[in-house]
């Protein structure tokens, strides 16, 4: 769900961290229309989430602390 | 201690709709996903859907996607989930599971399960 | 959707033997599989998470291990308690779906 960079909608599945590498953060006030998570995945995808989703908030909670920690 | 109470059973005729419960009990309800989970007589398991307590977002299984609804009610640590136009196919026993993302996103409590009978 | 096939389907086993069943994926899932123990006439119960780690309260003749897509779910000394069915699940990304199920029997 992204066009030129931006996501307009958000995915409807739920990811395991074990899936995803990184994550970009999209927010609507720079270009794009909606806030957003865009998950980097193992597959070389790129997944818009919704940022207000608990599964959203724990594994960008996940991957900030594994930055923190290297 | 962590438990789910599933009603034993529930008979209901074809085309009916049946709304079964869950109600928790022993943590705190809305930390937790919770996964209803299909099993007919002498098959598998089959994932129904997923409802966060916290915000009712829900994600459903596309084979289940009209046929299911989730829902919750935080005041009673219920949750709920509706079956509608019930044919035989729909005969089986439904389970609500707690999802822990802690535990590598595991179902780590499961409720006794209702047993649904879809008959004249 | 992800697909998970479990083998063999159904085993028989003799008191202190060890036995391994085997659950594959139609792609990687990368660790993100949990394995079930169901008893007759009872609700299943978590029994491996993350691929390797036991859950709380499980014997600790259970074991599991695999990565990419093949894994595998170890019972050594076999017991007349350990009579059921097991289950994988893959819970990469939803739709989660669980293996057909391995029936385990006492000779």
């Known amino acids: 769900a992204s066009n030129f960079d931006c996501c307009l909608g958000y995915t409807d599945r739920i990811l395991h961290p074990k899936f995803i590498v990184g994550f970009t953060r999209q927010l609507a006030n720079e270009g794009c229309d909606i806030n957003a998570i865009i998950f980097h995945t193992k597959k070389k995808l790129s997944v818009c989430a919704n940022p207000k989703q608990t599964w959203v908030k724990y594994i960008v909670r996940l991957l900030s602390k594994k930055v923190k920690n290297m | 201690q962590v438990q789910l109470q599933q009603p034993g059973a529930e008979l209901v005729k074809p085309g009916a709709s049946v709304k079964m419960s869950c109600k928790a009990s022993?943590?705190?309800?809305?930390?937790?996903?919770m996964h209803w989970v299909k099993q007919r007589p002498g098959q598998g398991l089959e994932w129904i859907g997923v409802?966060?307590?916290?915000?009712?977002?829900?994600t459903y299984n596309q084979k289940f996607k009209g046929k299911a609804t989730l829902t919750v009610d935080t005041s009673s640590s219920t949750a709920y989930m509706q079956l509608s136009s019930l044919t035989s196919e729909d005969s089986a026993v439904y389970y609500c599971t707690r999802g822990n993302y802690g535990v590598d996103y595991a179902m780590d409590y499961w409720g006794q399960g209702t047993s649904v009978t879809v008959s004249s | 959707d992800i697909q998970m096939t479990q083998s063999p389907a159904s085993l028989s086993a003799s008191v202190g033997e060890t036995v391994t069943i085997t659950c594959g994926a139609s792609e990687n899932i990368y660790g993100a599989l949990n394995w079930y123990q169901r008893k007759q006439g009872k609700s299943p119960q978590l029994l491996i998470y993350g691929a390797t780690n036991l859950a709380d309260g499980m014997s600790s003749r259970f074991s599991g291990s695999g990565s990419g897509r093949q894994y595998s779910l170890k019972i050594s000394s076999l017991h007349p308690d350990d009579v059921a069915t097991y289950y994988c699940?893959?819970?990469?990304?939803?739709?989660?779906?669980f293996g057909g199920g391995t029936k385990l029997e006492i000779k």
């Open positions: 022993g943590y705190t309800f809305t930390n937790y996903w």
């Open positions: 409802i966060d307590p916290s915000d009712s977002y829900t």
């Open positions: 699940q893959n819970v990469l990304i939803t739709p989660y779906t």
